[in-house]
């Protein structure tokens, strides 16, 4: 059998083969960060010879060359230093403006290992035009220097750089430039996941009904709320499974798409998902016309059933046919719903194309995009009804021009990306969608990204304090109600002296609220069982506080989901007829359930809630506690089934001041409060004035640490009695 020669090493780099040394196999070179391979790949021909794309000679020696970033071609109304033909990785370029001009963007930019500049385009602007000066990105040349309403500017890139973004932009009536900023990049450059995730996420969040409060100062950013919760989104996932995609990479495409689907369903919008795999021909695995496209389990299942081998007979990359099958799907749906109906016109459409190369058959994919734009009547007014994300993976044969042509162009957003590999793609999809920026009272959303603040991660978390020192914690369960522990109020202080501190994006200290009323469980009496040798009893340790004003929802303040409510049911994506018992079964679904509480310093700490038969072994050590319970005869009188138990294994123990805080868990990227911190056998903060200092109990401690949390599933009648008109409760 024919095979290609094996003398294809690259000095300083490595290579992988898609199908061994056999004809049809793609050899892909890779180099350490800061270097790029030249050539990037070779293809084993049926003749047994390696072919290098776009090479004149049949076999050039492969080398790793240093990555460089493009130099500014011109910089208006200012100067830049140093002036070089191109810049090495780690090199800086600095910008200064002439008198009378203000610098917008980054004054210093550094060349990154992917051949891209960090920061934002520097612009020297005097604010004279109807639109701001759109600037000239590094490596670009602009024609057009008038910025009045209707004026156009055009861009091209110098030498062999590739333009991504809009080659032409127009100053619109609202003072915003049409399209998206053009960037000139090296053909071998690629995007880092940490850049793509927020860029993709910002765009996607806008489409999903999110404004981005952190960026409201830039008026060009933040399309207003697009999809109300009654709106509908059609999401079309197009997965390349052509020959150049290895089976392993195809699996990662699938996994990434699954992550995407999982996240998208965690927004409480109506969504239908189509799944199309393609090589020479497309294969529709799920159509938006199928009622199952609205059901996450069905969508994920059809994704899981996508087979790499489905396309083994046709191994080209026919992106046109894939996009055309989206067009046909749209056309069928339009016929079904009626072209003039709101039902059709109000559907928003998002296409995500995951590909590893450029289309090599079937004609220009741009033709299909034009048809799609036409059928959806995409014009300046309806621009928000279509988003096409073109994501190239693997630096090889991905065609920047084609990706750029396919991706949507929207101001302040990017829709075309190239990632180094499928691992990077996976990272992007993991961190891309952040529901925490939604402005309505959607519950249980915390920002999970690595750079989020503690309060953004747990925006329901509040501090309850009298005028003097902090005493307790609590959780927002609506925009005006806080759930906490009754024992925080056992001294009977006038609650008008108390304050509730709620997270606020404008202040690291949060915002103080007065308490309109405190509802303390009448069953709570810490001395109720004194005559049974139980000096302190925490049954019914639950209270509700109504704040004097409503809390404005933000990244820092948002309610947690309470189980057994419609709100939580939506977040869990459970069917409509679900009951409270269903929620308990889903949330407390193991003998040991990983959960969290929030520490005095705001960090999220881990515990394991012991359930079922393990609950008793967790709870029974209380009988060894002789200080709190000197003459205890029946441990069941202290630890009733109102309590959840933690404190075994490597669990953290809550401190005294953490009482009343939520005990919560994460499901489907949303957070649910199952308990509230009540009492325990060990205080890890005892004797420490430092909020960050906690001491673990010595292993020899008798009794060992145990912590008890009011189980919200056992407090349903009381919660329903007081929150019946605030939350929508499910049947028990």
């Amino acid at each position: 059998a024919t095979s290609c020669p094996q003398n294809v090493n690259i000095s300083g780099g490595t290579f992988t083969l898609s199908h061994g040394w056999a004809p049809g196999s793609l050899l892909i070179y890779s180099c350490p960060q800061g270097l790029y391979p030249s050539p990037a790949s070779r293809l084993c021909k049926s003749s047994g010879q390696w072919q290098t794309p776009r090479a004149t000679r049949s076999l050039t020696k492969a080398v790793c060359k240093p990555v460089r970033c493009p130099a500014p071609v011109s910089f208006e109304n200012g100067i830049y230093t140093p002036r070089l033909g191109s810049y090495p990785v780690g090199g800086n370029v600095s910008f200064e403006c002439e008198d009378g001009f203000i610098l917008r963007g980054s004054p210093v930019r550094q060349c990154r290992p992917n051949g891209m500049w960090d920061g934002e385009t520097a612009v020297c602007d005097n604010g004279a035009g109807h639109c701001p000066n759109p600037g000239i990105s590094l490596g670009a040349v602009r024609t057009g220097s008038r910025f009045g309403h209707g004026d156009k500017v055009r861009y091209r890139c110098s030498s062999n750089l590739v333009l991504t973004g809009s080659a032409e932009r127009e100053c619109q009536g609202n003072g915003v430039w049409s399209g998206t900023e053009p960037i000139c990049r090296q053909p071998y450059s690629y995007d880092f996941p940490e850049d793509v995730a927020p860029a993709l996420g910002t765009s996607f969040s806008h489409m999903l009904g999110a404004t981005n409060p952190t960026q409201r100062t830039k008026e060009s950013l933040g399309r207003k709320i697009q999809i109300q919760r009654s709106g509908h989104l059609n999401l079309y996932l197009l997965l390349d499974s052509s020959q150049s995609v290895s089976e392993n990479d195809f699996l990662i495409f699938k996994e990434s798409a699954s992550l995407m689907v999982d996240r998208i369903f965690s927004f409480e919008i109506n969504v239908s998902v189509a799944i199309i795999t393609f090589a020479s021909e497309p294969k529709v695995l799920m159509s938006v016309l199928n009622v199952n496209s609205r059901d996450i389990t069905e969508v994920i299942s059809s994704l899981e059933n996508a087979k790499y081998k489905d396309h083994e007979n046709g191994t080209g990359t026919n992106t046109y046919a894939a996009l055309n099958s989206v067009y046909l799907m749209m056309n069928n749906q339009m016929q079904l719903l009626g072209m003039k109906t709101m039902a059709w016109q109000e559907i928003r459409h998002a296409i995500i194309l995951l590909t590893d190369g450029k289309s090599n058959m079937g004609g220009s994919p741009k033709t299909a995009v034009d048809q799609i734009r036409e059928i959806l009547n995409i014009n300046q007014k309806r621009n928000d009804y279509l988003d096409i994300y073109a994501i190239g993976v693997g630096k090889l044969d991905v065609d920047w021009r084609e990706l750029n042509e396919l991706g949507s162009k929207k101001d302040g957003e990017r829709h075309a990306f190239i990632l180094q590999d499928t691992k990077a793609l996976h990272q992007v999809f993991e961190h891309m969608l952040d529901v925490s920026k939604l402005t309505d009272t959607i519950c249980g959303v915390g920002n999970m990204s690595a750079n989020a603040s503690d309060q953004e991660r747990t925006p329901w978390h509040v501090t309850i304090k009298p005028k003097s020192q902090e005493t307790c914690r609590g959780a927002l369960i609506s925009d005006q109600w806080v759930l906490t522990a009754a024992h925080c109020f056992r001294d009977g202080n006038d609650h008008s002296l108390w304050r509730v501190n709620v997270g606020d994006p404008k202040s690291q200290w949060g915002k103080e609220f007065l308490i309109e009323k405190a509802v303390i469980s009448p069953g709570f009496d810490v001395f109720a069982k004194k005559n049974q040798g139980i000096l302190e009893f925490y049954g019914d340790d639950i209270a509700l506080l109504k704040l004097a004003q409503k809390v404005k929802m933000s990244t820092h303040a948002r309610p947690i989901c309470l189980p057994c409510t419609m709100e939580a049911n939506l977040a869990l994506r459970r069917p409509q007829g679900s009951t409270c018992r269903d929620h308990e079964n889903e949330l407390l679904n193991k003998q040991s359930v990983p959960a969290h509480f929030v520490a005095l310093n705001g960090s999220k700490l881990n515990i394991n809630l012991k359930m079922g038969v393990e609950w008793t072994s967790c709870a029974e050590v209380v009988s060894q506690e002789k200080t709190m319970f000197p003459n205890l005869t029946d441990v069941r009188e202290v630890v009733t089934d109102q309590f959840l138990c933690s404190g075994t294994q490597e669990d953290e123990s809550p401190c005294k001041g953490e009482s009343g805080g939520a005990v919560f868990l994460e499901r489907r990227f949303r957070f649910f409060q199952v308990g509230l911190v009540s009492w325990g056998l060990y205080n890890p903060c005892l004797g420490s004035a430092d909020k960050n200092s906690r001491k673990r109990a010595p292993r020899s401690k008798v009794p060992p640490p145990r912590d008890f949390h009011i189980n919200l599933f056992r407090m349903q009648p009381w919660l329903r009695q007081h929150l019946g008109d605030v939350l929508n409760f499910l049947p028990l």
Partner: antibody, heavy 122, light 108 residues
Framework: QVQLRESGPGLMKPSETLSLTCTVS????????YYWTWIRQPPGKGLEWI?????????DYNPSLKSRVTISVDTSKNQFSLRLNSVSAADMAVYYC??????????????WGQATLVTVSS | SSELTQDPTVSVALGQTVRITCQGD??????ASWYQQKPGQAPVLVLY???NRPSGIPDRFSGSSSGNTASLTITGAQAEDEADYYC???????????FGGGTKLTVL
């Protein structure tokens, strides 16, 4: 509404292996909060717990039967099964499958199957 | 010991109150659960925990516990309450369960 239904042979010969299956509808055997249980009742006598299984694979058995009994769960079919080796006349009983639930200090069986009578005779 | 002891038979006049008891060491740690079984039928859970009734069980059934003894009380016994009553509880670790020998309740 949760329903359990036992199935398996009614007549056995001594020393054979008894295999019973319980099919669960209206609920899932992979739910992590329940203990899928077999209980038997010899004619005219009281209830005897045979064993319980948690979907993750942990099983507990009556010490008097431990050497002969195996309980397993098949999540794909939403079923759990009982295997009792080397049956004898002493194993003749009505066999129930049931769903066990542990809450606080109590442990109870909230749903039962309709029962299957197993006769052992040579 | 892992035994639960019940009186084999108890009788009660219609409309009167009757108490059925269950004794065993495990009841010092765990609450008993109670089941009613009528001839030819599967047992039905009537009480669990300290004193909890599943939905559909009349409130004339109540439970209590003291030391190593658990009690099921029927206040105002009805003819349809005539049945065998079994108690059960966990013992030791895991899901080990023990049943009482059963009490046959006759309503006169």
């Amino acid at each position: 509404q949760v329903q359990l239904r036992e199935s398996g042979p009614g007549l056995m010969k001594p020393s054979e292996t008894l295999s019973l299956t319980c099919t669960v509808s209206g609920g899932s055997v992979s739910s992590g909060v329940y203990y899928w249980t077999w209980i038997r009742q010899p004619p005219g006598k009281g209830l005897e717990w045979i064993g319980s299984m948690f979907y993750s694979g942990n099983a507990d058995y009556n010490p008097s039967l431990k050497s002969r009994v195996t309980i397993s769960v098949d999540t794909s079919k939403n079923q759990f099964s009982l295997r009792l080796n080397s049956v004898s006349a002493a194993d003749m009983a009505v066999y129930y499958c049931a769903r066990g639930y542990a809450s606080g200090w109590s442990y109870y069986f909230d749903y039962w199957g309709q029962a299957t009578l197993v006769t052992v005779s040579s | 010991s892992s035994e639960l002891t019940q009186d084999p038979t108890v009788s009660v006049a219609l409309g009167q109150t009757v108490r059925i008891t269950c004794q065993g060491d495990s009841l010092r740690t765990y609450y008993a659960s109670w089941y009613q079984q009528k001839p030819g039928q599967a047992p039905v859970l009537v009480l669990y925990g300290k004193n909890n009734r599943p939905s559909g069980i009349p409130d004339r059934f109540s439970g209590s516990s003291s030391g190593n003894t658990a009690s099921l009380t029927i206040t105002g016994a009805q003819a349809e309450d005539e049945a065998d009553y079994y108690c059960n509880s966990r013992y030791s670790s895991g899901t080990h369960v023990v049943f009482g020998g059963g009490t046959k309740l006759t309503v006169l």
